[in-house]
């Protein structure tokens, strides 16, 4: 018996087609992805093949103005229109709190939403009961397939699930649910989830009875043969893991942003054992036409986005200096504002010992592309912020050693004075540079805000200590010459859309007045 698994993950509100780098579509003839194009390909496969499942491994939420405006209603609507068969909860599904998951998505989805390792407690338990499930048995042709879900146990550090959801260890939580499916005579089981490729492989290895793992969170691109675009494969598709009980378990993921549709064909014997597996992600490029009815629906929903862009988010009573002569040379208050917003967006009081899990932000000055003038009645709009942050990135959480951070700050001023973009703006950091010293030895003081403290204060950076830092994905990927970050980071979790982080902060504060306050000094 043959099953076709179509899968997406980490779509991050890319409902419309995008450029090849998953930012806003500029040249339509070269654009990719989007739900209208995805639907065309899915329907094509459904018509051609008998047993097809369309699955999503989480993180539909967060990433573009679509999510900012529609808050998840767009996800339910278009996933329903595409007739997804199941979805696993990702960490970003909790970005607007549990209510922001329940109302727009859980209550509106016409497909099961899954996670076996999230347990509700207290008053939430009855409120959320039945709205998401640990597993679901789906009829496919003449057979049944069990889908069991999982979500990163780091979600409390990455999003806003509140205090009434417990995120258990994935493997510990999955095993009893898979055992339950086995007792129900379900012998074909897919683990669908959002914990990253390393955990996907562990699940394939450790959870007895799982036949296939469909993952997300790490934006992993797997491919067999010559890759069709610029993503470099992390391994073959499917990636085969030998389980502890000797089975060959295929593990797949389909990069991110709806650029590819994962396509995996599995052949099972009559006892539900995987005989063979093969496939590849399908690049959703412009050779695949956008479905006209879905496209028309997208255009209808788009109207509200254009109106939103010019609405006031909040006010500034000071000039927000995003000029290159400030932000690429010294501390600028636009950099301070953005870094403060980045930290505020990551406030998670998950442990009594820590006032917060992260206190530091770094931001390349070259990423700031416009000032905002307070003399326009102080009004700040999404449109204004899109000029400040025009490149459509995310603000991510990384873990770095102190020694890596020191290298990053040396890099910040290694060729100071040429208006180059690597000059770092900061939050939760006090740095002093001496430009009379030779490049690579210019940081004379580097103090960082403690996290394991009840009264936050600045302490000298320790070279061997591991620190959490919020920074643009551009820096996490080694941009502006920050190769040391890319090479030495110990963990990287992708975060929220840059503009969304700042707009949320401004809306929350209502009136802002960031100052230049001595975060960056020159001796």
């Amino acid at each position: 018996w043959e099953l076709t698994i179509l899968h997406t993950n980490d779509v991050h509100s890319r409902l419309e087609q995008t450029s090849e780098d998953s930012s806003k579509c500029v040249n339509a003839s070269r654009c990719m992805g989007g739900v209208a194009r995805l639907f065309t390909k899915v329907q094509q496969i459904r018509r051609a093949e008998p047993n097809v499942l369309l699955l999503d491994a989480g993180d539909q939420y967060q990433g573009t103005i679509w999510f900012t405006v529609y808050k998840g209603a767009e996800v339910a609507h278009f996933m329903n229109a595409l007739r997804y068969d199941a979805m696993a909860l990702g960490n970003h599904e909790f970005d607007n709190g549990v209510e922001g998951l329940i109302e727009p998505l859980l209550k509106e989805a016409k497909f099961p939403i899954l996670s076996a390792n999230i347990k509700a407690k207290g008053p939430l338990a009855s409120q959320i009961s039945g709205l998401y499930l640990p597993y679901k048995v789906l009829p496919v042709g003449d057979e049944v397939v069990g889908i069991v879900g999982y979500t990163s146990k780091e979600t409390p550090f990455l999003s806003n699930p509140g205090t009434n959801l417990v995120f258990e260890d994935e493997i510990t939580a999955l095993q009893p649910e898979v055992d339950k499916l086995k007792t129900l005579n379900v012998n074909k089981i897919i683990a669908l989830g959002h914990s990253g490729f390393e955990m996907d492989k562990l699940i394939a290895q450790k959870v007895r009875g799982v036949d296939v793992v469909v993952g997300g969170h790490s934006n992993t691109f797997l491919y067999t043969g010559n890759p069709p675009s610029k993503e470099v494969p992390a391994g073959k598709y499917p990636f085969i893991v030998t389980s502890d009980d000797g089975r060959k378990v295929p593990v797949v993921q389909a990069y991110a942003f709806g650029k590819y549709l994962g396509y995996l064909k599995i052949e099972f014997d009559e006892r539900g054992n995987v005989i063979s597996s093969h496939g590849n992600p399908i690049l959703l490029n412009s050779s695949i036409p956008e479905d006209p009815s879905i496209k028309a629906d997208i255009n209808k929903w788009r109207i509200k986005l254009d109106n939103y862009s010019t609405q006031e988010l909040g006010k500034t009573i000071v000039y927000l200096d995003g000029s290159s002569q400030s932000c690429r040379f010294r501390e600028c208050n636009m950099g301070n504002l953005i870094c403060d917003a980045m930290i505020n967006n990551n406030l998670r009081h998950t442990d009594e010992m820590f006032w917060n899990h992260v206190s530091m932000c770094i931001l390349n000055g070259g990423g700031i592309r416009s000032p905002i003038d307070e003399r326009n009645n102080g009004t700040i709009t999404w449109e204004n912020l899109a000029a400040v942050l025009p490149f459509g990135g995310t603000f991510d959480l990384v873990q770095l050693k102190g020694s890596t951070l020191k290298k990053a700050f040396e890099h910040s001023v290694h060729r100071y004075g040429q208006s180059t973009g690597e000059f770092l703006q900061v939050g939760g950091i006090h740095v002093v540079y001496d430009l009379s010293r030779k490049p690579g030895d210019r940081v004379v003081k580097l103090d960082v805000l403690c996290t394991k403290c009840r009264v936050p204060s600045y302490d000298p950076l320790k070279m061997d200590e591991v620190y959490k830092v919020i920074l643009p994905n551009f820096l996490a990927n080694g941009g502006d010459g920050f190769q040391m970050i890319k090479d030495e980071l110990l963990r990287h979790d992708s975060g929220d859309q840059d503009i969304n982080v700042v707009s949320t902060y401004i809306s929350k504060m209502k009136v802002i007045y960031p100052a230049v306050e001595g975060r960056i000094k020159f001796s």
């Epitope: 450029s19 780098d21 930012s23 500029v26 040249n27 000029s323 290159s324 002569q325 690429r328 592309r369 416009s370 000032p371 899109a386 000029a387 025009p390 490149f391 459509g392 990135g393 290694h414 060729r415 040429q418 208006s419 551009f474 080694g478 941009g479 010459g481 190769q483």
Partner: antibody, heavy 117, light 105 residues
Framework: EVQLVESGGGLVQPGGSLRLSCAAS????????MHWVRQAPGKGLEWVAV????????YYADSVKGRFTISRDNSKNALYLQMNSLRAEDTAVYYC??????????WGQGTLVTVSS | IQMTQSPSSLSASVGDRVTITCRAS??????LAWYQQKPGKAPKLLIY???TLQSGVPSRFSGSGSGTDFTLTISSLQPEDFATYYC????????FGQGTRLEIK
């Protein structure tokens, strides 16, 4: 569709002046640092000048310093190159180009400047 | 900072593996880009940050190096690859190499 269209090239006598323009469309012009690059007939590429996205920083190649001035008007999505005291060795196709940013870079198709008596 | 490319010209056949090198007169970290130019056309960005492939550029192109020595490699030459290639540093005010003309053997 991203477009950069250069204009203003032509024949000019040594010592003369010319103003090149570059009209940008299809992208957020005010977010990008902009460059002028030139190519003499049958020769290689030579970088000429750059201006930051907000116009606050400008840098020039030594060969044009003091003679050429780069400017921009973000309200008009336009980049300019004022060329004074032109010499025969300034004869080239002049390209305007964006910085290499998140999406790579964009180039115009060039405008030919000929300095000859 | 001066950029020296070698060779200045190169003859090769379709299917060949080709390597072009670029040397900076002083260390430029990874602030290096590679461009392809065809006659009468504007240059086209292939690689930036020494090794990052630009969107839409075939994966047969790759870049490597850091500091002063850099390499552009075309793993299997295609007919459309015959052109002139330039390296460019952006560590200080930008500077191009003198170019490498890649011709059909």
């Amino acid at each position: 569709e991203v477009q950069l269209v250069e204009s203003g090239g032509g024949l000019v006598q040594p010592g003369g002046s010319l103003r090149l323009s570059c009209a940008a469309s299809g992208f957020t012009f005010s977010s990008y640092d902009m460059h002028w690059v030139r190519q003499a007939p049958g020769k290689g590429l030579e970088w000429v000048a750059v201006m930051s996205y907000d116009g606050s920083n400008k840098y020039y190649a030594d060969s044009v310093k003091g003679r050429f001035t780069i400017s921009r008007d973000n309200s008009k999505n336009a980049l300019y190159l004022q060329m004074n005291s032109l010499r025969a060795e300034d004869t080239a196709v002049y390209y305007c180009a964006t910085e290499i940013a998140a999406k790579g870079d964009y180039w115009g198709q060039g405008t030919l400047v000929t300095v000859s008596s | 900072i001066q950029m020296t490319q070698s060779p200045s010209s190169l003859s090769a056949s379709v299917g060949d593996r080709v390597t072009i090198t670029c040397r900076a007169s002083q260390g430029i970290s990874n602030y290096l880009a590679w461009y392809q130019q065809k006659p009468g056309k504007a240059p086209k960005l292939l690689i930036y940050a020494a090794s990052t492939l630009q969107s839409g550029v075939p994966s047969r192109f790759s870049g490597s190096g850091s500091g002063t020595d850099f390499t552009l490699t075309i793993s299997s030459l295609q007919p459309e690859d015959f052109a002139t290639y330039y390296c460019q540093q952006s560590y200080s005010t930008p500077h191009f190499g003198q170019g490498t003309r890649l011709e059909i053997k």
